[in-house]
Every structure is written in C-alpha cells, then in structure tokens.
Interface confidence: low
Amino acid sequence: FPTSLSDCQTPTGWNCSGYDDRENDLFLCDTNTCKFDGECLRIGDTVTCVCQFKCNSDYVPVCGSNGESYQNECYLRQAACKQQSEILVVSEGSCATDAGSGSGDGVHEGSGETSQKETSTCDICQFGAECDEDAEDVWCVCNIDCSQTNFNPLCASDGKSYDNACQIKEASCQKQEKIEVMSLGRCQDNTTTTTKSEDGHYARTDYAENANKLEESAREHHIPCPEHYNGFCMHGKCEHSINMQEPSCRCDAGYTGQHCEKKDYSVLYVVPGPVRFQYV
C-alpha cells in the first residue's frame, strides 16, 4: 500500500485505490489529507485530491519562488497544489527577465523602477523599443508587428481596450510608458460607456487616471461571501458589496451570467507564461 498521498500522484490530481481502509485509515479525508489547498474527495474506495481552483480572470501577475510567473496569486496556489510543493509569491508583477535582454517580451520590462547602473543614451529606450544610435532625432524605434496576432480582447491599465496583448505592448512601446494587462475582455463597467477614440481603441470615458487605484478601491468595497453562499457562483468568485443586499459573482474567464453559469464562447484565453504570452 502507498504510505502517503504523494505516492498516488497523477497529472490531474492524486488517486489512491485498492487499499483497505479498515487496516489503514490514512486516506480518510481530513484537514491534513490534501496539502496546499487541494480538495479531498472520497468516492467509494478512492480518495482523490483535486486542484480545481476557481481562479478569476484578473490579471494581477505575481512571480513565484520557482521563478515562474502566474496570472494572479490564485493560479500560483493552484500550481503549488498540482505540484504538491510550496510556491511562494516572491514579488508582484511577472518574474523579471534578464537585464538588458531587449526582447520586450517581459510584461514588466522597463517597469519604471530606478535603475542602479550608469545610463547610456540607449538606456532611455524601454518597453520593447530598440535603440537606433544612427538615427538623428528618433532614438527609440518600435519594431512590433501585431498583424499576425489573434483577436483576444484585453483591458489595459490605461483604461483602453485592445484587440490583443501585442497591441498593448505596441502602445506601451510607442508611448514609452508602462501599460499592462488589467483583465481579460474589453474594459467594462456597469456605469460606463466606451467610445472609440482617434487611434481606433475603445476608451472608457470615466476611467480614473490610475487604474490600479481604481481596482484597489473597488476591492476594498467587496468582501468574500458568507459560507452559506457556497455554490452561489458556479464558475466564479462570490463577492458581497457593502452597498448591495445581494452578493454578486465575478466570473472566471470564459463564463458569464448572474451566477457565472453560462459559457461565454466569445472569450479566447490568454495564459501568461514565464516571460511571454502564450495563446492556447
């Protein structure tokens, strides 16, 4: 018989069958059965640890102690559960790329942190821009081609909606300022409208200057739902606003409806990899 759940690991979870629970009660579901927030399910003679975290689609990237980047802290915990190993959040934002790689693929490349090295004329080019030392006036050139990139609408930290992550990178490069993915899908808000601006992007008319502050203040007004609301949101996170009687659901990517019960086929998924976006 296996001596611990780690002996029962499968790619999707852990599966221990064929043991006699009269002789060995090790595999009864209790608080210690599934480590790293795995959900213990006992079905007949089988105990399985499942790591089906209901992570929302918020793009609040974090860097794990394993050097991997995750879309948000929930996905990091899900990975820790699946790997059955401790992964800590070591910093906010994607894991830093090698200094001076110039790839422009890092989500937080040129994040505006004060550099502690001597700057040359080319160091002023950030956010994926390439330095052209032969140019007479324009030092920083953005050679980013988004023409072959899939449609995958995203809401960015400048309050504008973009057709894909490449366009956000392109805008960030052209403006030489940090523009990040804030969430999947177009920017939307019950109280706001979107207007198409001159550059062809959709801009929220009332968007606050600092999207981070807006997001933080919104979160401060939401508290997790009481336990008796378990199951209220089928594919999402239940939140109780201090201004509302009834709780609301923040749906996972790909789901919609009051209880996140409907599949939203219009959403393509963006999964941030360690450094670059991967489209799946």
Epitope: E86, L88, V90, S91, E92, Q116
Partner: antibody
C-alpha cells in the same frame, strides 16, 4: 501612520509559556499584509518565528512549530504570540512586524521590541 | 532551511568610503531578498526589498543587486549615521531566514 507596540511580561520561568501581544494602530490587521514575530537573542542575529496573515492563516518556523501559536483579536486589532515550554535559549528581544505588501514578505513596520528573559 | 551567509561579519570604514556587503543563499531565492539596518537598542529598518528596490525614504547611497544566490548591498559613500549592523533576509521559501549580520564600525 502605522504603529506596532509589543507588550507582555519581561520575565518568564523555564517550562512556562511566553505570551506577548502586538497592538496595531493605523491599519486593520484584517485588511491586508502579513503580521510576523521575529526575535533576537542578546548579541545575536534575527530569527523569523512565524506570521498570521490578514485572512487568519498561519505560517510558523518549523524549528518552533510544536511550541508556537500566533493568533489574533480582530476586535482589538492586535495579534499575539504564545511560546510554550520555554528555556533560557528563548531569552531574546521579541519584535512584531508587518509585511511590506502583498507578494513581498520583507518587513517595513516594526515594533520597538520587548526583552523577555527566561529565568527561574 | 535556506542558509544566508553574510560576509564580512564586521568591517571598519571611514566616512565617504564605498562599502559592499555580500550575502550568499544556499539555494536559488530568485530576487526575494531584503536588507535591513539595525542600530543598537533599536528595531531593524527596511532598506532594500526584492533584491534591488529601495524602500520609501531610504537614501540613494544605498543600493542592492543580485539574483539567484548572490546578493550585494552597497553604500556608495558612507555617512556617520550609517554605522550599524546590516542583515539580509530571504523570503523565497519558508522558513524565512536572515544572514548573520555585518557590523559596520568606524575606522
């Protein structure tokens, strides 16, 4: 401004339980961050003991795991340390501290520290 | 546990000197390293977090660098108020651990 203040007996007898409290002002301990206890034996270095997070979950240093409990009283906005079966080796200055921010466990706000001597 | 080996354990320097303190982790800690300054009878004060980010209000003469296993705290021009003990801390893995400290004394 955020302030942390440790309190508790300065003298504890061997084999007894050391109990300290950290009163926090200027920020609600349930709103965010990680709330740690760190100790420093006289003339020696720092040792992280454990923390309680804003959601009430704990992490402890395995070297103390069987003896340490960190709890909180949200109504008083304070968190507490209990260390059982103390010996002279537990004589130290005990600090409470707050984590810098979500996703970063370095500590930016510290109490002034309180010396606890274990002696009969 | 991850060991943080700090060197030197003590050093003597003069005002205006450039001072470098190193910290070596026993395994990869990415950039999850902080540096603290502690003066006698006082609580430690955060100087650097995430290996290279200066904490609010910390003078620009303090800088941090490194990733993986090797980290450095540099004081570009030592000031009278900088004489103290400095500690590195890793927070990549539980339990969080500190280096043994470097005491910076007046020459």
């Amino acid at each position: 401004d955020v302030q942390l203040q440790e309190s508790g007996p300065g003298l504890v007898k061997p084999s007894e339980t050391l109990s300290l409290t950290c009163a926090v002002s200027g920020y609600s301990i349930t709103s965010g961050y990680y709330w740690s206890w760190i100790r420093q034996p006289p003339g020696k270095g720092l040792e992280w003991m454990g923390f309680i997070s804003y959601d009430g979950s704990n992490k402890y240093n395995p070297s103390l795991k069987n003896r340490i409990t960190i709890s909180r009283d949200t109504s008083k906005n304070q968190f507490s340390l209990k260390l059982s079966s103390v010996t002279a080796a537990d004589t130290a200055v005990y600090y409470c501290a707050r984590g810098l921010r979500r996703g970063d466990y370095s500590m930016d706000y510290w109490g002034q520290g309180t010396l606890v001597t274990v002696s009969s | 546990d991850i060991q943080m080996t700090q060197s030197p354990s003590s050093l003597s320097a003069s005002v205006g000197d450039r001072v470098t303190i190193t910290c070596k982790a026993s395994q990869n800690v990415v950039t999850a390293v902080a540096w603290y300054q502690q003066k006698p009878g006082k609580a430690p004060k955060l100087l650097i977090y995430s290996a290279s980010n200066r904490h609010t209000g910390v003078p620009s003469r303090f800088s941090g660098s490194g990733s993986g296993t090797d980290f450095t705290l540099t004081i570009s021009s030592l000031q009278p108020e900088d004489f103290a003990t400095y500690y590195c801390q890793q927070y990549s893995s539980y339990p969080f651990t500190f280096g043994g400290g470097t005491k910076v004394e007046i020459k």
